[in-house]
């Protein structure tokens, strides 16, 4: 603790002129003080003065009044500092002294002699307001007042609690009468040193350095610092934490880049033509008939669904088709023969059976021939049966469809999940697409199957071929190879015209 | 018991960057209570603070070198550093890092035993 | 730039006090801080928040501060205190060491 015992003198009169001894001063009692401060006693005694003691100059003959002064000699009031804690009581003794040497120093003058004296004994606590006293004895009368205060930085009500106003990175504060902290606006924390963030920002994915400031941790943006960065080229997707590409629907891939959708999203098939979806940008147009090409946008010609029968010709014509039929046919589309049995008009082994009295006849085919005079063989893939891409084949008396990965069923039409028998290891998700799964493998995995274990950062060797990029962050320590065009591969090192392109996970 | 441990070069060439690290063991660098501070003391010569960092990465640089100061923090290895750029002759020194406890009103009770840094060609 | 000016040097005789002083505009209203540094070794803090003393430093070190100084006082020096003493203080958010006093104990 610390803090100051005031003095303030005010009046002393000695109308006579005398000393405490009876004898009177010549030519007047030229008074000094001498003050002594100790700890409490019910009777006062000689001894040191504890709490401290000081003298003044020569303040006056006879009577007076004491003026207060700043500084210098004759102070006034008379400070008498203390560095411990202000134990609340005190004992005074004022002396008043005549001297005959020098008005300055006159403690050390020899001859001084004792004018009167007072003892104050009691309790004080520490406060701003003067506590004014008045002591007589036969000879003389004193007027003074007294008080503690604190010395500054110290406060509470026996000076021991320091505090020191601070506005720096240790503290914000200003100081309490009682010497708490009271902080300024914006910081808060026991030192005050804690600041105030902006209202709303979240707790754990802001903080801030100075008050009303939102400073967003890794991975996380906006004012409030309570939306998540998804990783760096997701496309269409979102993230629920930091780093991630949650696809939206219809799309895939690592950076939801794959079109999964589309037909939706593109509608590539024309002239009323079906759009199925067969993985990222991938689909096949089922035309109508009289329409061809990949997206259907080429009409066929009239002649293209073969109408003349019996081996006549067909010629375009502007709306229509004309048919040139053989000899011993007739009619639209050549249906009609002027042929008989007798001029054995059936093919490839086909019976003849006279009609109409034998003006006309009918030819019935023996297996895989078809036609009005069995001259044609069958085609069972005419009717294109196999679905979702796949090749119809010819065999013998039937047919079967080759189907493309992914598909199965007598015409392709079931989609096999690829996914199904988890191929990824070490939690991997799997993504079926239309050359095979693919494994996006979490954080220190990588390889097809997400089978390796990564120890190091996989980017810096440079794996990546051909000008593609290399991302890490998505799975920490696995590496992802974005193939730029007319490129495949895990690393990117394929020509097109290999495996399909996608951003494998190395 | 809480330790600290500056490590990097001995050696440094006139116009490089001397770069530092100070690794905090036996207690968190990601407390409230603490700043972390670097100080150094040219041979012969007293004490210059450098500058402090709070685990958040608020910097507080010497104005006299602050063009040249950058103090960075790694909580997650429990680290921080410092990077002196374009060191001159007069950048020689032992180079101190600290804990400067906001309790103690910024005193720095816990000092690394210092690392020699020489500026020479 | 705030400045602490300290004596260069004070002898001392074992079992005397030695007083070092640390003198900056109104230092009083900062918290001063003491170092000990013995050579080739790290200083450590002896006072801390004027007259504090942390945990194992011996009560004979003492300090006190107001007006423009701040002292720090051995009392009943010993040899093993021969040391070079540093003051710091916080300028707004800047430390500032004094030039530091080399204790000789005679």
């Known amino acids: 603790g610390s803090g100051i015992f005031q003095l303030r003198l005010q009046e002393f009169v000695n109308q006579r002129g005398m000393l405490a001894n009876g004898q009177s001063c010549e030519p007047g009692c030229r008074t000094f003080f001498r003050i002594c401060l100790k700890h409490f006693q019910a009777t006062f005694s000689e001894g040191p003065c504890t709490f401290g003691n000081v003298s003044t100059p020569v303040l006056g003959t006879n009577s007076f009044v004491v003026r207060d002064k700043n500084s210098g000699s004759g102070r006034n009031p008379l400070q008498l500092p203390f560095n411990f804690t202000w134990p609340g009581t005190f004992s005074l003794n004022i002396q008043a002294w005549h001297t005959p040497g020098d008005d300055l120093r006159p403690e050390t003058s020899p001859g001084n002699s004792l004018i009167s004296q007072i003892i104050i004994q009691g309790s004080l606590a520490v406060g701003k307001i003067w506590r004014t006293d008045e002591q007589n004895d036969t000879l003389t009368r004193l007027s003074y007042s007294y008080r503690v205060i604190c010395s500054d930085n110290y406060y509470g009500e026996s000076c021991s609690r320091l505090c020191k106003k601070r506005d720096d990175h240790f503290g914000h504060y200003e100081c309490q009468p009682d010497g708490s902290l009271s902080c300024l606006p914006g910081w808060t924390g026991k030192y005050c040193d804690q600041p105030i963030c902006l209202s709303g920002c979240h707790e754990q994915n802001g903080y801030c350095s100075k008050p009303d400031e939102c400073i967003c941790r890794p991975g996380w943006q906006g004012r409030l610092c309570n939306e998540c960065i998804p990783h760096n080229g997701c496309r269409h997707g979102t993230c629920s934490i930091p780093w991630q590409c949650a696809c939206d629907e219809g799309w895939g891939g690592l950076f939801c880049d794959q079109d999964l959708n589309y037909c939706t999203h593109h509608s590539p098939c024309k002239n009323g033509s079906t759009c199925s979806n067969s993985g990222p940008k991938g689909y096949t147009c089922t035309c109508l008939p009289g329409y061809t090409g990949e997206h259907c946008e080429l009409g066929l010609s009239k002649c293209a669904s073969n109408p003349c029968r019996n081996g006549g010709s067909c010629k375009d014509q502007e709306n229509s088709y004309h048919c040139l039929c053989p000899p011993g046919y007739y009619g639209q589309h050549c249906e009609h023969s002027t042929l008989t049995c007798a001029d054995s008009p059936c093919f490839n082994g086909g019976s003849c059976r006279e009609r109409n009295q034998g003006s006309s006849y009918a030819c019935e085919c023996p297996p895989n021939f078809t036609g009005s005079n069995c001259e044609k063989k069958v085609d069972r893939c005419t009717s294109n049966p196999c679905a979702n891409g796949g090749q119809c084949q010819n065999r013998g008396p039937s047919r079967t469809c080759r189907c493309r990965p992914g598909f199965t069923g007598t015409h392709c039409e079931l989609h096999i999940s690829d996914c199904a028998r988890s191929p990824c290891a070490h939690g991997g998700t799997c993504h079926d697409l239309e050359n095979g799964p693919v494994c996006t493998c979490p954080a220190g995995f990588s390889g097809r199957r997400c089978e390796v274990r990564i120890t190091h950062d996989a980017c810096a060797s440079g794996p990546c071929f051909n000008g593609a990029t290399c991302y890490t962050g998505l799975s920490p320590n696995n590496f992802v190879c974005n193939c730029p065009y007319g490129f495949v591969g895990s690393r990117c090192e394929f020509p097109v015209g290999l495996p399909p392109s996608f951003p494998w996970v190395a | 018991e809480v330790q600290l441990q500056e490590s990097g070069p001995g050696l440094v060439k006139p116009s490089e960057t001397l770069s530092l690290t100070c690794t905090v063991s036996g207690g968190s660098i990601s407390s409230s209570s603490y700043y972390w501070g670097w100080i150094r003391q040219p041979p012969g010569k007293g004490l210059e603070w450098i500058g402090d960092?709070?685990?958040?990465?608020?910097?507080y640089y010497n104005p006299s070198l602050k063009s040249r100061v950058t103090i960075s923090v790694d909580t997650s290895k429990n680290q921080f550093s410092l990077k002196l750029s374009s060191v001159t002759a007069a950048d020689t020194a032992v180079y101190y890092c600290a804990r400067e406890d906001v309790i103690l009103r910024g005193g720095s009770d816990y000092w690394g035993q210092g690392t020699l840094v020489t500026v020479s060609s | 730039s705030y400045e602490l000016t300290q004596p260069p040097s004070v002898s001392v005789s074992p079992g005397q006090t030695a007083s070092i002083t640390c003198s900056g505009e109104r230092l009083g209203d900062k918290y001063v801080s003491w170092y000990q540094q013995k050579p080739g070794q790290s200083p450590v803090l002896v006072i801390y928040?004027?007259?504090k003393r942390p945990s194992g430093i011996p009560e004979r070190f003492s300090g006190s501060n107001s007006g423009d100084t701040a002292t720090l006082t051995i009392s009943g020096t010993q040899p093993m205190d021969e040391a070079d003493y540093y003051c710091?203080?916080?300028?707004?958010?800047?430390?500032?060491f004094g030039y530091g006093t080399k204790v000789t104990v005679l």
């Open positions: 960092i709070y685990y958040t990465g608020s910097t």
């Open positions: 710091q203080a916080w300028d707004r958010d800047t430390g500032v």
């Open positions: 928040e004027d007259f």
